[in-house]
């Protein structure tokens, strides 16, 4: 049999080998496709199937506009002028080239030593699904699950049957100061079909700098609480990946598991004191927040006590 590839929506003509070019002809076309359950023999006189597959006067079969449901096998059996039976067998596959792939939500820059989402490559309207590949400086990127991570998603349109592919690339650059170029390509995996490429994106890789600031938020504001109340201390750090956070009270580390939140339920006078948090980042030394004072008072004094944070309830390291 012969393998035929046809573009969706385009006409396709299959010739019936051995068939006389003009009537009288002895021939039979049959098909087994997504429109049939078994073999369907086409009537030479034509009929309702003509919109899908029609026998032409020369014995060839015309598919006026191939669709996904027309994939399958087409066979012709003809008797030539010498009375010999000749068979033709075609395996028809259809394809649709999608629009040019695009990198959506691209990163503006990358940070060395930490995971960075480069962007999401999107291809819409392909058949069959095809594949998306990422390239770094023109070379194919092979995801290793560690430094190079690719998250893929394939969706099929319920009516058209065409595919949308999404591929999200995350990388951990090893060093700063470089300017890698990323691109993405779509391939249908068909012979003689060149991949479709996105416009490349060039990104700067910077060294991971120290966290821009470390803030200690206290609830209730002012750090003044009645006995039996609850105090929540939150260490807010703008660093990626999030560092480990330890807590200090009156200059001594608290024996607690690392956490960016310290909860003091049912406080008593023993909980009074000066609290701060220490953030430890893998590529930097520890950073300590400005301290806050916690006071337990029956009267609910107005205004913050001396040494406590101001009205905003947060201290900021300049």
């Amino acid at each position: 049999g012969q393998n035929i590839t046809a573009r969706i929506g385009e006409p396709l003509v299959l010739s019936c080998k051995g068939a006389p070019k003009k009537p009288p002809q002895q021939l039979e076309w049959k098909l087994n496709t997504g429109r049939t359950e078994a073999w369907k023999v086409l009537s030479p006189q034509g009929g309702p199937w003509d919109s899908v597959a029609r026998i032409l006067p020369n014995g060839s079969l015309l598919l006026p506009a191939t669709g996904i449901v027309d994939e399958g096998t087409f066979r012709c059996r003809a008797t030539n002028r010498r009375g010999k039976e000749v068979k033709s067998n075609y395996r028809v596959r259809v394809y649709q080239i999608p629009g040019k792939p695009e990198i959506v939500d691209p990163a503006s820059e990358l940070t060395a030593s930490v995971p960075n989402k480069v962007g999401t490559c999107v291809s819409e309207g392909s058949y069959p699904a095809g594949t998306l590949s990422w390239h770094l400086d023109g070379k194919l990127l092979i995801p290793d699950g560690k430094e190079t991570l690719v998250k893929e998603e394939t969706r099929r349109h319920p009516e058209t049957g065409l595919f949308t592919l999404r591929s999200e690339l995350t990388v951990i650059p090893t060093q700063g100061g470089t300017h890698p170029t990323f691109s993405c390509s779509f391939s249908l995996g068909l012979p003689r079909r060149r991949p479709l490429n996105t416009a490349p994106i060039q990104l700067r890789v910077r060294e991971p700098g120290p966290p821009e600031g470390i803030q200690l938020l206290v609830e209730p504001e002012g750090g003044i609480v009645a006995p039996g109340g609850t105090v929540t201390l939150t260490c807010a750090i703008s660093a990626q990946p999030p560092p480990q956070v330890h807590w200090i009270k009156d200059g001594a580390p608290l024996p607690l598991a690392p956490s960016p939140v310290l909860l003091l339920p049912e406080v008593g006078h023993e909980d009074e004191g000066t609290y701060s948090c220490v953030a430890t980042h893998p590529s930097h030394g520890p950073q300590e927040s400005p301290p806050v004072s916690i006071r337990v008072t029956e009267t609910g004094d107005e205004g913050p006590a001396e040494g406590s944070v101001g009205e905003s309830g947060l201290g900021t390291l300049a």
Epitope: R35, E37, S43, Q45, G47, P48, D50, S51, V52
Partner: antibody
Framework: EVQLVESGGGLVQPGGSLRLSCAAS????????MTWVRQAPGKGLEWVAS????????YYPDSVKDRFTISRDNAKNSLYLQMNSLRAEDTAVYYC????????????WGQGTLVTVSS | DIQMTQSPSSLSASVGDRVTITCRAS??????VNWFQQKPGKAPRRLIY???NLADGVPSRFSGSRSGTDFTLTISSLQPEDFATYYC?????????FGGGTKVEIK
């Protein structure tokens, strides 16, 4: 909204001719095959003719072949049925319907037009 | 030519009844059968297409099924507006052939 409106029916003598029209709106006319179906008084439905979307290919049952001609004007979104050599048994309500191939088969119908063949 | 033998030709039923109408094709027509409803003085309305698919705007009490060359239209719970004549149609081959019709009347 898809609409099919037939016209041209009436009383005609045996052996006479009549031309029915069907005005289509609300859809892309040249994307669809079109079909005429008739119904004699108190009887069932009978297929009369079909035409492909381009108008190049037409189809008829033996009962009307060589007497009836289906045609279309895609520029005018119109379907026609030219009926010649009319017989008493052609008396029926004639409906125009969208489709007639295996992709779309008679999914929308007009209200019908009555053709009476009588002397 | 393909024959579509529809049965019964008429039936009497009450509101709420389950009603079944059958068409048998004289040869294989695949899935290419439609069901239509027609009320007096009105054009037919397609209910089911390609044997089992419910047409747009048709209540879900209507359903179609197929077993080989036997096609069935079922109304799960007959409503007052369902009293009408029902036709099957084969559109796999020319001539397109309708069944003889089934008139559903009030008992």
């Amino acid at each position: 909204e898809v609409q099919l409106v037939e016209s041209g029916g009436g009383l005609v003598q045996p052996g006479g001719s009549l031309r029915l029209s069907c005005a289509a709106s609300g859809f892309t006319f040249n994307n669809y095959w079109m079909t005429w179906v008739r119904q004699a008084p108190g009887k069932g439905l009978e297929w009369v003719a079909s035409i492909d979307n381009s108008g190049d290919n037409t189809y008829y049952p033996d009962s009307v072949k060589d007497r009836f001609t289906i045609s279309r004007d895609n520029a005018k979104n119109s379907l026609y049925l030219q009926m010649n050599s009319l017989r008493a048994e052609d008396t029926a309500v004639y409906y125009c319907a969208r489709g007639g191939d295996i992709k779309v088969s008679l999914d929308r119908w007009g209200q019908g037009t009555l053709v009476t063949v009588s002397s | 030519d393909i024959q579509m033998t529809q049965s019964p030709s008429s039936l009497s039923a009450s509101v709420g009844d389950r009603v079944t109408i059958t068409c048998r094709a004289s040869q294989d027509v695949g899935i290419y059968v439609n069901w239509f409803q027609q009320k007096p003085g009105k054009a037919p309305r397609r209910l089911i297409y390609r044997a089992t698919n419910l047409a747009d705007g048709v209540p879900s009490r209507f359903s179609g099924s197929r077993s080989g060359t036997d096609f069935t239209l079922t109304i799960s719970s007959l409503q007052p507006e369902d009293f009408a004549t029902y036709y099957c149609l084969e559109f796999d081959e020319h001539p397109l052939t309708f069944g003889g019709g089934t008139k559903v009347e009030i008992k």
